[in-house]
């Protein structure tokens, strides 16, 4: 009686179970009553990452430098190429099909989390007592200078964009 289901790594064709091709290989011909499944290795720049019955291998992803991409991990016959972004850029999606420049944190904001190849810069406002006077993709908010520890007095209070201005003691009103 012909089978209705096959074991793992097999497929049903013409009322019989044939072996699937292993990762890195494509199907050339199905098995018969007398012959095994015929498989062939994928060519250069091709891959198949599962046990399969595909007649064509997939092309490796191309990391287009014009889109800011570079190869993070070269593909094999069993794995696709993994792209990432050039330094200072990050992927626009999980598939990393293109890149955008890392965001800079404006004055008054500091970097909470530095960008990676897959995530943008996260900025946070500088709270009272801290400042950032630059637009930067890596600078955190800096604490205001303590004039007292320098034996000076505050001439002008700091803001979220400027440090305290210290001056000599005799400036005290």
């Amino acid at each position: 009686e012909p089978p209705t289901a096959c074991r793992e790594k097999q497929y049903l064709i013409n009322s019989q179970c044939c072996s699937l091709c292993q990762p890195g290989q494509k199907l050339v011909s199905d098995c018969t009553e007398f012959t095994e499944t015929e498989c062939l290795p994928c060519g250069e720049s091709e891959f198949l990452d599962t046990w399969n019955r595909e007649t064509h291998c997939h092309q490796h992803k191309y990391c287009d430098p014009n889109l800011g991409l570079r190869v993070q991990q070269k593909g094999t016959s069993e794995t696709d190429t993994i792209c990432t972004c050039e330094e200072g850029w990050h992927c626009t999606s999980e598939a990393c099909e293109s890149c955008v420049l890392h965001r800079s944190c404006s004055p008054g904001f500091g970097v909470k989390q530095i960008a990676t190849g897959v995530s943008d810069t996260i900025c946070e406002p500088c709270p009272v007592g801290f400042f950032s006077n630059v637009s930067s993709a890596f600078e955190k908010c800096h604490p205001w200078t303590s004039c007292e520890t320098k034996d000076l007095v505050v001439q002008q209070a700091g803001t979220n964009k400027t440090d305290v201005v210290c001056g000599p003691q005799d400036r005290l009103r």
Epitope: G110, K112, Q113, E124, P125, C126, P127, V128, G129, F130, K140, C141, P143, W144, S146, E148, V153, V154, Q155, Q156, A157, N160, L172, R173
Partner: antibody, heavy 122, light 113 residues
Framework: QVQLVQSGAEVKKPGSSVKVSCKAS????????IEWIRQAPGQGLEWMGS????????NYAQKFQGRVTITADTSTSTAYMELSSLRSEDTAVYYC???????????????WGQGTLVTVSS | DIQMTQSPSSVSASVGDRVTITCRAS????????????LAWYQQKPGKAPKLLIY???SLQSGVPSRFSGSGSGTDFTLTISSLQPEDFATYYC?????????FGQGTKVEIK
């Protein structure tokens, strides 16, 4: 101990100005911030502005910008809040409070004056 | 400006009850550099000036009874009175001090049931 003593109640006519004082003692007045907060009858707390007496640096809430002036006299450890162009909606209790002490790590208001009632009425 | 929203606006409770007041900020009050939440809680009784209870969201001000506690981080904060005492019937305010202008919640009145 830290103390903030405010001037007495005032009754003012609409269009006039009021100047409330806040005399500080028991801490270094010049480096600490003095904050001004008001509370209209039956209402919540509303921050108006602040001053660091030693530097004369001030911050004002947008709502009061141009109508409030906060000053301080370090020789008498007294801060002042002047509100001009008074209207009936300015009827409130005005409080001074101590903010940061110059350490930049304690911006909350740990000591308050007793409050000054300002009544604006024609 | 950072908006502070308190709830409920009033609560009726009995002596011995556990009372919880919440406060929500329109933006995070947690600063990553020092891992501090820039939030304070105050108590105000009729005709009196407000009194500081809690600062940095969870630090108890000196002299404040331990039945008061503060918790929360980022945008959501809670003031808890574990066992309400007769002297705790008052209005409670949250306030942020992250950046100017400082703003207060609208207040929560704790009334006798």
């Amino acid at each position: 101990q830290v103390q903030l003593v405010q001037s007495g109640a005032e009754v003012k006519k609409p269009g006039s100005s009021v100047k409330v004082s806040c005399k500080a003692s028991g801490y270094t007045f010049s480096t600490s911030w003095i904050e001004w907060i008001r509370q209209a009858p039956g209402q919540g707390l509303e921050w108006m502005g602040s001053i660091q007496p030693g530097s004369g640096s001030t911050n004002y809430a947008q709502k009061f910008q141009g109508r409030v002036t906060i000053t301080a006299d370090t020789s008498t450890s007294t801060a002042y809040m002047e509100l001009s162009s008074l209207r009936s909606e300015d009827t409130a209790v005005y409080y001074c409070a101590r903010g940061d002490d110059g350490s930049y790590v304690r911006w909350y208001f740990d000591h308050w004056g007793q409050g000054t009632l300002v009544t604006v009425s024609s | 400006d950072i908006q502070m929203t308190q709830s409920p606006s009033s609560v009726s409770a009995s002596v011995g009850d556990r009372v919880t007041i919440t406060c929500r900020a329109s933006q995070s009050l947690l600063f990553s550099v020092n891992q501090k939440n820039y939030l304070a809680w105050y108590q105000q009784k009729p005709g009196k000036a407000p009194k500081l209870l809690i600062y940095w969201a969870s630090s108890l001000q000196s002299g404040v009874p331990s039945r008061f506690s503060g918790s929360g981080s980022g945008t959501d904060f809670t003031l808890t009175i574990s066992s309400l005492q007769p002297e705790d019937f008052a209005t409670y305010y949250c306030q942020h001090y992250y950046s100017y202008p400082w703003t207060f919640g609208q207040g929560t009145k704790v009334e006798i049931k």
